[in-house]
């Protein structure tokens, strides 16, 4: 499907609005420090150029690849070396090396200020004064902070952002209408970003075979009535979409995602009975809906798997003929029967099955050797079941904040070398698994919990890769994608760790504590808790609980005082001294 001008092809397929939005996202994800106005200028220049190519595909430079066009445009930025340092060296390279170089310089933790939400009236005025600029600013600010955000999905978020302002800025109580919607978009956006980051890590660090295996398992759970060939086609197409988006090819990615949505809606009967309501929606909403669609009902008459995968005398013959196809079919068959399993568990089972066949098909009596292969799955299944049961029990006992604290202590003891902000961020997010998954019925708990934990632990891996400090983290992150969570779960107290020297400054607090939101107060306290464990890794839970209770009481007392700062100055050193004594 070759076109004389790739840029004209994508402009015509996507339309001007989506074209401009996607180019803005692409540029913002590459040059994360550039000011908004600079990106808008670049996007306008690219758009004008694209229009000339639509008018005449033979016009000068219209035959160039998108990477060449976009890369050339990015390399015109005057302050590239001052702002980005060695990233400027990318511009000396030729495609495709130049694009690879830009990709390698994407920063998962850019040094950008947190987004501050202005007053509702200020936002509504800005929205009414210049809606287009307001929405572009949203795309820019999200994309530069989340350089792997799934671009076509970000357009969907922007559409919802626009709809929220259009509705709520007319409402009698603007704030009551708007703020919950913005909170929801923020939380869903962070979750969407983290999920996509795992997909990109899977593709980039473990290859498309790993991603395809994940997709076979997930789509087989969603579409248990679909034939294996149908699932395989969807997996191939989905892999192409995500490979493109993770590689910065956002126009191709969005175009192919639209094609995939079209195909799914034209072939609902052979995919799933759950697609109907998605397929009536406009494009962005439709694609989102299809991605989030609930699992279809399992066919009633599915036979036992043992016949084809254990009892059959042809197992080794079938395996040898086409290993990946045979394993893919095994994974498909297992996953469609087990919506109650996490995708990661299903992949572990497929891996265990593959290892057994590799060993047994070379044995004297293969059938005798692999006859009990399904029995070997039992401990693999029980491990996440027990983990979810235990952690949900702990969550229900402690509540979210204290559950997060338990995880903070646990992970700080496991990997105390990791930076305190990273431990706080990751443990807080690990702790959110309780509220998200523990209320669900038993059959949905494990897929919810373990697949969510995989997303959160990927964030730890991504941050740690930027600044590696722990061999244990590197090992868990790089050895096996599917065993990351069990690897972290199995880590014990790091006995080799030399406790951090006590620093009174770390435990010095001021009156500004009192004006913080509840969430910010929690983060402050949790930061102190991590530092406490780094200082005393063998402190007992009772000791830590005692110190944290005293901390809460001290902050509450000083925030009620008339002279708050004086109280913090006087009571702070007492709290520090008492804490040191309690932990001695």
């Amino acid at each position: 499907d070759t076109h004389k001008s790739e840029v004209a092809h994508r402009f015509k397929d996507l339309g001007e609005e989506h074209f401009k939005g996607l180019v803005l996202v692409a540029f913002s994800q590459y040059l994360q420090q550039c000011p908004f106005e600079e990106h808008v200028k670049l996007v306008n220049e690219v758009t004008e150029f694209a229009k000339t190519c639509v008018a005449d595909e033979s016009a000068e430079n219209c035959d160039k690849s998108l990477h060449t066009l976009f890369g050339d445009k990015l390399c015109t930025v005057a302050t590239l070396r001052e702002t980005y340092g060695e990233m400027a060296d990318c511009c000396a390279k030729q495609e495709p090396e130049r694009n690879e170089c830009f990709l390698q310089h994407k920063d998962d933790n850019p040094n950008l200020p947190p987004l501050v939400r202005p007053e509702v009236d200020v936002m509504c005025t800005a929205f009414h004064d210049n809606e287009a600029t307001f929405l572009k600013k949203y795309l820019y600010e999200v994309a530069r902070r989340h350089p792997y955000f799934y671009a076509p999905e970000l357009l969907f978020f922007a559409a919802r952002y626009k709809a929220a302002f259009a509705e709520c800025c007319q409402a009698a109580d603007k704030a009551a209408c708007l703020l919950p919607k913005l909170d929801e978009l923020r939380d869903e956006g962070k979750a969407s970003s983290a999920k996509q980051r795992l997909k990109c890590a899977s593709l980039q660090k473990f290859g498309d075979r790993a991603f395809k295996a994940w997709a076979v398992a997930r789509l087989s759970q969603k579409f248990p009535k679909a034939e294996f060939a149908e699932v395989s086609k969807l997996v191939t197409d989905l892999t192409k979409v995500h490979t493109e988006c993770c590689h910065g090819d956002l126009l191709e990615c969005a175009d192919d995602r639209a094609d995939l949505a079209k195909y799914m809606c034209e072939n609902q009967d052979s995919i799933s009975s759950k697609l109907k309501e998605c397929c009536d929606k406009p494009l962005l909403e439709k694609s989102h809906c299809l991605a989030e669609v609930e699992n279809d009902e399992m066919p009633a008459d599915l036979p036992s798997l043992a016949a084809d995968y254990v009892e059959s005398k042809d197992v080794c013959k079938n395996y040898a003929e086409a290993k990946d196809v045979f394993l893919g079919m095994f994974l498909y068959e297992y996953a469609r029967r087990h919506p109650d399993y996490s995708v990661m568990l299903l992949l572990r089972l497929a891996k265990a099955y593959e290892a057994t066949l590799e060993k047994c098909c070379a044995a004297a009596d293969p059938h005798e050797c692999y006859a009990k292969v399904f029995d070997e799955f039992q401990p693999l299944v029980e491990e996440p079941q027990n983990l979810v049961k235990q952690n949900c029990e702990l969550f229900e006992q402690l509540g979210e904040y204290k559950f997060q604290n338990a995880l903070l202590v646990r992970y700080t003891k496991k990997v105390p070398q990791v930076s305190t902000p990273t431990l706080v961020e990751v443990s807080r997010n690990l702790g959110k698994v309780g509220a998200k998954c523990c209320k669900l019925p038993e059959a949905k708990r494990m897929p919810c919990a373990e697949d969510y934990l995989s997303v959160v632990l990927n964030r730890l891996c991504v941050l740690h890769e930027k600044t590696p400090v722990s061999e244990k983290v590197t090992k868990c992150c790089t050895e096996s994608l599917v065993n990351r969570r069990p690897c972290f779960s199995a880590l014990e107290l790091d006995e080799a760790y030399v406790p951090k020297a006590f620093n009174a400054e770390t435990f010095t607090f001021h009156a500004d504590m009192c004006t913080l939101s509840e969430k910010e107060k929690q983060v402050k306290k949790q930061t102190a808790l991590v530092e406490l464990v780094k200082h005393k890794p063998k402190a007992t839970k009772e000791q830590l609980k005692g110190v944290m209770d005293n901390f809460a009481a001290f902050v509450e007392k000083c925030c009620k005082a008339d002279d708050k700062e004086a109280c913090f100055a006087e009571e702070g050193p007492k709290f520090v001294a008492a804490s040191q004594a309690a932990l001695a």
């Epitope: 646990r410 014990e492 839970k541």
Partner: nanobody
Framework: EVQLVESGGGLVQAGGSLRLSCAAS????????MGWFRQAPGKEREFVAT????????YYADSVKGRFTISRDNAKNTVYLQMNSLKPEDTAVYYC?????????????????WGQGTQVTVSS
């Protein structure tokens, strides 16, 4: 602070049984998950079994499942490990451990208080 004292270890023939006890001092015994761990000579300490604070949840290592049973009596501040069908590979020092608030995790780092251990030797 919780003190733990194990008893009931000894020498037993393969196929035989033993019952280990762990007595805890302290008024808050029922707030703790209790675990049994073991360490064979030259090996790492390994998880054996655990029971949550109420006794409602138990977990076992695959190697002992179906042979060992953990139980507790909160009125007596005691946790038990009934070991049946013992094998020579069960030979080890058995430790009792306590974890505040825990549902009974399998990691030794979760447990703050440990007993001195009791020797179990299974001869063939």
């Amino acid at each position: 602070e919780v003190q733990l004292v194990e008893s009931g270890g000894g020498l037993v023939q393969a196929g035989g049984s033993l019952r280990l006890s762990c007595a805890a001092s302290g008024r808050t015994f029922s707030s703790y998950a209790m675990g049994w761990f073991r360490q064979a000579p030259g090996k790492e300490r390994e998880f054996v079994a655990t029971i949550n604070w109420s006794g409602g949840s138990t977990y076992y290592a695959d190697s002992v499942k179906g042979r060992f049973t953990i139980s507790r009596d909160n009125a007596k501040n005691t946790v038990y490990l009934q070991m049946n069908s013992l094998k020579p590979e069960d030979t080890a020092v058995y430790y009792c451990a306590a974890d505040l608030y825990g549902p009974g995790f399998v990691l030794s780092m979760e447990y703050d208080y440990w007993g001195q251990g009791t020797q179990v030797t299974v001869s063939s």
